[in-house]
Interface confidence: low
């Protein structure tokens, strides 16, 4: 049978099913984890759930062959196989490759550099999240969209604060961190503003080099 790919967020409830109808009046249906470990078997009008890490977390719908898994975790990453024994004695097989990703954590925005350069302000910010394979996008008053973890920009003298948002995302979730910067360029840290949870509907973090050295977080 063909292989279907599914990507889901950890902690969610997942339905593994095939897009086509099951063979009519099949004799037996079995779901396997990594090809050889039985999760559940339907036979003679009964579902039998096997001793496995899925016990208590799965439910089979014999009508459609769908396997419901509650609260999936990254350890559930695997290829799942549904094997059906047809009335004629032949077997049919479908495979689903399940990728479970954690929701991305909230990013920390770190001030790497902030200095006056010819009356302009050079700003280097990095968007940090612990060891994840994610996509980065910076938003704000920028000449173009920046799609990596570091933002470098030079600001002409200005009176108003400028805000920069780093969005980290994977295929199942995204989170934002926003840093607002007020002139002058080398102002004390207190004049930099971390947008609050109320402002953006999610908690963001900001740390500067000094913060790192003093183990102090805003």
């Amino acid at each position: 049978g063909r292989l279907v790919h599914m990507t889901v967020v950890s902690g969610s409830n997942v339905t593994l099913n095939i897009s086509e109808s099951l063979p009519e009046n099949y004799k037996q249906l079995t779901w396997f984890y990594t090809f050889d470990q039985k999760i559940v078997e339907w036979d003679s009008g009964k579902s039998k759930y096997f001793e496995s890490k899925f016990k208590g977390r799965v439910r089979l719908d014999p009508q459609s062959g769908a396997l419901y898994i509650s609260k999936v975790q990254k350890e559930d990453n695997s290829t799942y196989v549904m094997r059906v024994l047809k009335k004629d004695g032949y077997e049919q097989e479908w495979k689903i490759k399940l990728q479970v990703l954690d929701p991305v954590p909230k990013p920390v925005i770190k001030i790497e550099k902030r200095e006056d350069v010819d009356d302009n302000c050079y700003l280097k910010l990095s968007c940090v999240i612990p060891g994840e394979s994610v996509n980065y996008t910076w938003y704000g008053e920028l000449p173009k969209e920046i799609q990596n973890s570091v933002l470098e920009t030079t600001l002409k003298p200005h009176k108003h604060s400028r805000c920069y948002t780093c969005q980290v995302s994977n295929s199942v979730s995204s989170k934002n961190g926003t840093f607002c910067f007020s002139p002058p360029c080398t102002a004390a840290r207190s004049e930099q503003k971390l947008i609050s949870e109320e402002d953006l509907g999610g908690e963001q973090k900001l740390i500067s080099e000094e913060d790192l050295h003093h183990h102090h977080h805003h």
């Epitope: 003679s44 009964k46 039998k48």
Partner: antibody, heavy 120, light 109 residues
Framework: QVQLVQSGAEAREPGASVRVSCKAS????????IHWVRQAPGQGLEWMGW????????NFAQKFQGRVTMTRDTSLITAYMDLSRLKSDDAAVFYC?????????????WGQGTLVTVSS | EIVLTQSPATLSLSPGERATLSCRAS??????LAWYQQKPGQAPRLLIY???NRATGIPARFSGSGSGTDFTLTISRLEPEDFAVYYC???????????FGQGTRLEIK
């Protein structure tokens, strides 16, 4: 029409065994599981286990493991339940019941019940 | 083992009234719950399965609802023949087992 007809009342002494039979008619016997449920006087329903008449496979409630035997005779389209080492609190009406088709363990047709008394 | 708790133990109502019987499971049973009616000297009769499906031949005044741990059997307008004991029942696929609630006696007021 579907019918399950059970054997008559039985009286036993403590420590003895009893056999209750359940004769099916009106459907294909081997297509449906037969369950056994007991009900002590004035009490609720207590599931004992099932037998798959097709294969003879059985499954019992933990409480009855080791004391109950369920068998069937497909030529007589009859299921049997044997309970051994009877105690006074085994006195009850014993029912056989048939599975709802393919549903897994909802009981749509019941026998009339067999009263078993246990006393010395 | 999943325990089913029925309430109230006894319900006293008059014909024509609405009856509401409750069944609570100690852990989720999804929709795998049935209701039975038992009259004195008779075998139980299946009324509702999969929480809300009426069994063959059951009058429309009987309805079931709920999922997870909380279930309700409603008799919209009581007829004299509805006064009986009602049991809820759940099925566990593994280990394969059936358990019944302790029953609710519905009596004429």
């Amino acid at each position: 029409q579907v019918q399950l007809v059970q054997s008559g009342a039985e009286a036993r002494e403590p420590g003895a065994s009893v056999r209750v039979s359940c004769k099916a008619s009106g459907y294909t016997f081997t297509d449906y599981f037969i369950h056994w449920v007991r009900q002590a006087p004035g009490q609720g329903l207590e599931w004992m286990g099932w037998i798959n008449p097709n294969s003879g496979a059985t499954n019992f409630a933990q409480k009855f493991q080791g004391r109950v035997t369920m068998t069937r005779d497909t030529s007589l389209i009859t299921a049997y339940m044997d309970l051994s080492r009877l105690k006074s609190d085994d006195a009850a009406v014993f029912y056989c019941a048939r599975d709802v088709d393919g549903s897994g363990w909802y009981l749509d047709f019941w026998g009339q019940g067999t009263l078993v008394t246990v006393s010395s | 083992e999943i325990v089913l708790t029925q309430s109230p133990a006894t319900l006293s109502l008059s014909p024509g009234e609405r009856a509401t019987l409750s069944c609570r499971a100690s852990q989720s049973v999804s929709i795998y719950l049935a209701w039975y009616q038992q009259k004195p000297g008779q075998a139980p009769r299946l009324l509702i399965y999969d929480a809300s499906n009426r069994a063959t031949g059951i009058p429309a005044r009987f309805s079931g609802s709920g999922s997870g741990t909380d279930f309700t059997l409603t008799i919209s307008r009581l007829e004299p023949e509805d006064f009986a004991v009602y049991y809820c029942q759940q099925r566990s696929d593994w280990p394969p087992s059936i358990t019944f609630g302790q029953g609710t006696r519905l009596e004429i007021k």
